[in-house]
């Protein structure tokens, strides 16, 4: 049997060592003990008694099925306990009695049906994070379950087989920053929602089939809900159930952010909320994020005209990796307050973008992200976006563009342009002179000779440049990142010619450790203040005898340098 490995600070690693019991020889010097992924099955009352100063105990996936009632009695200093993914079919309050310092407790993935006969947590007054439940057997949430818990930073409940929720069970916790609920059906959603209205600031609903969700008024008095964020992950919705979900928003008037991740919409976007919902809901929602939305019939998707008025105040929208190929003009025109739009990893081409960025579209838009779409012409893209009078920042990275033409038109306020990973080989005057930040990293550039009088930040890493660009091109440059190119040297004169340069990241280049370069680096200790990742990323490529040495450590031969 293998043994534990411990470091000087008392952190002991015993993961995946085939332990069949808690190893002997544990001491009070241990601060952290990880026995995850073993075959321990049983923890006896004396197994951990020596660990009086233990702060972290991890026993994830160790096949534990029995823990003696007083097994943790000496762990008064314990702050982090992970018992997840074991074989504990019942939970005992006696385990947790002594753990008054506990901040993190993970009991998830054990085959219990309820959280024990009596309240488990009354003594855990410092608890901040609690994870409970499982996929198959956890079927009941009761009023006694959370007794003694008044405030939690994170509560995660996996209740995919929930058959009974006792009303007010979650109400006893007065403050929950982030509640994650894994529910397979929406049967108890309204009851739970009513109980957490006054306590939860961020509600995350996972793996829930909401197709049959039906709203009914909640049995709550006037409540000022602190909920700011609502997220749906892996949920299934229909056009009808979306309308019903909207009705919940009248109870969470401070809501500012809504998120849908990995959801499926079995519908066409033919939402038809009642007039009262449209007027009052989404009042303070400023951020809507949708990632990997699956719409089986996305070619039939509606233009969302029925919810235009819902979205007029929204400031930030992300619709990422959701097969968007066109945003209808009228929809764009109704997004009057929109300042940030991210359409990354979609299917937009310039010719359909033209429809989306029509006259009057996105009148307040400042930042547009079209990374990894199907854009092909930089010239057309710039021209199409001329309608966006307030656009300052454009990310068109990870599109494969045709060669850059000599001249292009861009929105006149544009200050930031991301052209990274676009396959460009040459930069031309197509790039606007108004830029303050330009990212052309991860391309095929072997030179950069474009005058950009306002440029403050240049990101040009992962290209093929052999020298630093000429400083006269960027009179006000503050930051240059040029790592992973083929730069062989830099000198005092070169660096000195950038009058305002504060940060230079030039590591992982092919430095020729000449006498000049090495004497410059030795004479200039202040390099550490300007060079990011100095000295570890600055290595000699040649001459052969210095290959792999740090510039800082490399010493030129006296013979070579005094010829």
């Amino acid at each position: 049997q293998e043994s534990l490995s411990c470091d000087a600070s008392g952190v002991c690693d015993g993961r995946s060592r085939s332990f069949t019991s808690i190893p002997s020889g544990l001491t009070a010097a241990m601060k952290s003990l990880d026995l995850s992924f073993n075959k321990i099955t049983y923890i006896g009352h004396g197994d951990l008694r020596a660990c009086a100063n233990l702060q972290v105990l991890m026993l994830k996936s160790s096949r534990i099925n029995t823990i003696e009632g007083d097994a943790f009695y000496s762990l008064g200093s314990l702050e982090h306990l992970d018992l997840s993914d074991n074989h504990l079919s019942s939970l005992s309050s006696s385990w947790f009695g002594p753990l008054s310092s506990l901040k993190y407790l993970n009991l998830m993935g054990n085959p219990y049906q309820t959280l024990g006969v009596t309240s488990l947590f009354p003594n855990l007054t410092n608890l901040q994070t609690l994870r409970i439940g499982n996929v198959e057997t956890f079927s009941e949430i009761r009023r006694i379950d959370f007794a003694g818990l008044t405030s939690l930073n994170e509560l995660e409940i996996k209740a995919l087989s929930l058959r009974n929720y006792q009303s007010q069970s979650l109400k006893s916790i007065r403050d929950i920053h982030h509640l994650t609920l894994h529910l397979s059906e929406s049967a108890f959603l309204l009851e739970i929602f009513a109980d957490i209205l006054s306590s939860v600031r961020y509600l995350e609903l996972r793996d829930t089939n909401l197709a049959r969700f039906q709203f009914s008024p909640l049995p709550v008095d006037e409540v000022s809900s602190p909920m700011k964020k609502l997220a749906f992950r892996g949920s299934v919705l229909t056009d009808e159930s979306f309308n019903e979900l909207l009705k919940l928003l009248r109870y969470i008037l401070e809501l500012s952010e809504v998120e849908f991740d990995d959801c499926t919409l079995n519908g066409l976007g033919d939402f038809n909320p009642s007039e009262s919902d449209v007027v009052s809901e989404l009042g303070k929602v400023e951020t809507v994020t949708i990632r990997r939305l699956h719409i089986p019939q996305f070619y039939l998707f509606y233009d969302l005209s029925t919810v235009y008025s819902l979205l007029e105040k929204v400031k930030r929208i992300t619709v990422e990796n959701s097969k968007v190929f066109l945003v209808p003009c009228s929809f764009s025109q109704h997004l009057k307050s929109l300042e940030f739009l991210d359409l990354s990893e979609n299917l937009m081409v310039e010719e359909y973008l033209k429809n989306s960025a029509c006259k009057g579209a996105w009148p307040s838009l400042q930042t547009l992200v079209l990374s990894q779409n199907h854009l092909r012409s930089m010239q057309k893209t710039g021209e199409i976006l001329l309608t966006l009078k307030n656009l300052t920042s454009l990310d068109i990275s990870r599109n494969t563009f045709h060669p850059m033409p000599d001249s292009c038109q861009w929105p006149e306020k544009m200050r930031f342009l991301n052209l990274s990973s676009t396959g460009i080989r040459v930069v031309k005057t197509c790039i606007p002179q108004t830029l303050e930040v330009l990212d052309v990293s991860n391309n095929n550039l072997d030179s950069f000779s474009l005058f950009l009088p306002r440029l403050q930040e240049l990101y040009i890493s992962r290209n093929k440049l052999k020298t630093l660009p000429d400083a006269s091109l960027f009179p006000v440059l503050l930051v240059m990142k040029i790592r992973e190119n083929a730069v062989s040297t830099f000198s005092k004169d070169q660096l000195g010619s950038f009058p305002k340069l504060e940060t230079l990241e030039a590591g992982d280049n092919h430095f020729v450790c000449s006498c000049e370069l090495l004497s410059f680096t030795m004479e200039t200790p202040a390099l550490a203040q300007i060079l990011v990742d100095w000295p570890d990323s600055y290595l000699c490529d040649s001459p052969p005898r210095l290959h792999g040495h740090r510039l800082q450590d490399a010493r030129p031969s006296v013979l070579e340098c005094h010829q």
Epitope: Y299, L300, D303, F325, L326, C329, F331, E345, L347, V349
Partner: antibody, heavy 118, light 111 residues
């Protein structure tokens, strides 16, 4: 440059299955959909379906739902179409094509000729 | 399914003249201001080649003598002036509704 290289001609017996391949190069495979199109001898074009390599999602012409299975191997940037229970009706040239902008097929493979005959 | 009817099935034209091929859809292929209609050219023994997408956008690298027009259900492909290289098959294709469908094709011939 963008290329879709399809596997060579196939001669198979009725009732058998065949797996055609389409190897992509010159573009980010996971960013585009791959479509399959059938062209019978001296005939028009018939859309079979698409697959999106990024998430493996597929969509089929109902006429081919029980006939074709679409898969991808993102590590080799290759799309596959397996055709089952072949009959002489399935003898045709099969093209793979890259789907751009969600709506048009801008690059096509050279086609694979399938002959079903005993 | 949306049925696309191309006419004529074959068209005889003189080199240097204009050729117009029509494609009629059994229902509208409009999607909020964009017509999801494409045109492809196919030479014998070769795969189809994209000429026009979104009814009127000429694909990069396609000669300017090719143009597309139309909206709703009626679309046309124009070639002017016709060159010898153009005397091949042409197909329209809609991507408004699944399943995507192609027209039956129009064969260009020299008059």
């Amino acid at each position: 440059q963008v290329q879709l290289q399809q596997s060579g001609p196939e001669l198979v017996n009725p009732g058998a299955s065949v797996k055609l391949s389409c190897k992509a190069s010159g573009f980010t495979f996971t960013t585009y959909g791959i479509n399959w199109v059938k062209q019978g001898p001296g005939q028009g074009l018939e859309w079979i379906g698409w697959i999106y390599p990024r998430d493996g999602s597929t969509n089929f012409n109902e006429n081919f739902k029980d006939k074709a299975a679409l898969t991808v191997d993102t590590s080799s940037s290759t799309a596959y179409m397996e055709l089952h229970s072949l009959t002489s009706e399935d003898s045709a040239v099969y093209f793979c094509a890259r789907l751009t902008g969600g709506t048009f097929l801008d690059y096509w493979g050279q086609g694979t000729t399938l002959t079903v005959s005993s | 399914d949306i049925v696309l009817t191309q006419s004529p099935a074959s068209l005889a034209v003189s080199l240097g003249q204009r050729a117009t091929i029509s494609c009629r859809a059994s229902e509208s292929v409009e999607y909020y201001g964009t017509s999801l209609m494409q045109w492809y050219q196919q030479k014998p023994g070769q795969p189809p080649k994209l000429l026009i997408f979104g009814a009127s956008n000429v694909e990069s690298g396609v000669p300017v003598r090719f143009s597309g027009s139309g909206s709703g259900t009626d679309f046309s492909l124009n070639i002017h002036p016709v060159e010898e290289d153009d005397i091949v098959m042409y197909f329209c294709q809609q991507s408004r509704k699944l399943p995507w469908t192609f027209g039956g094709g129009t064969k260009l011939e020299i008059k």
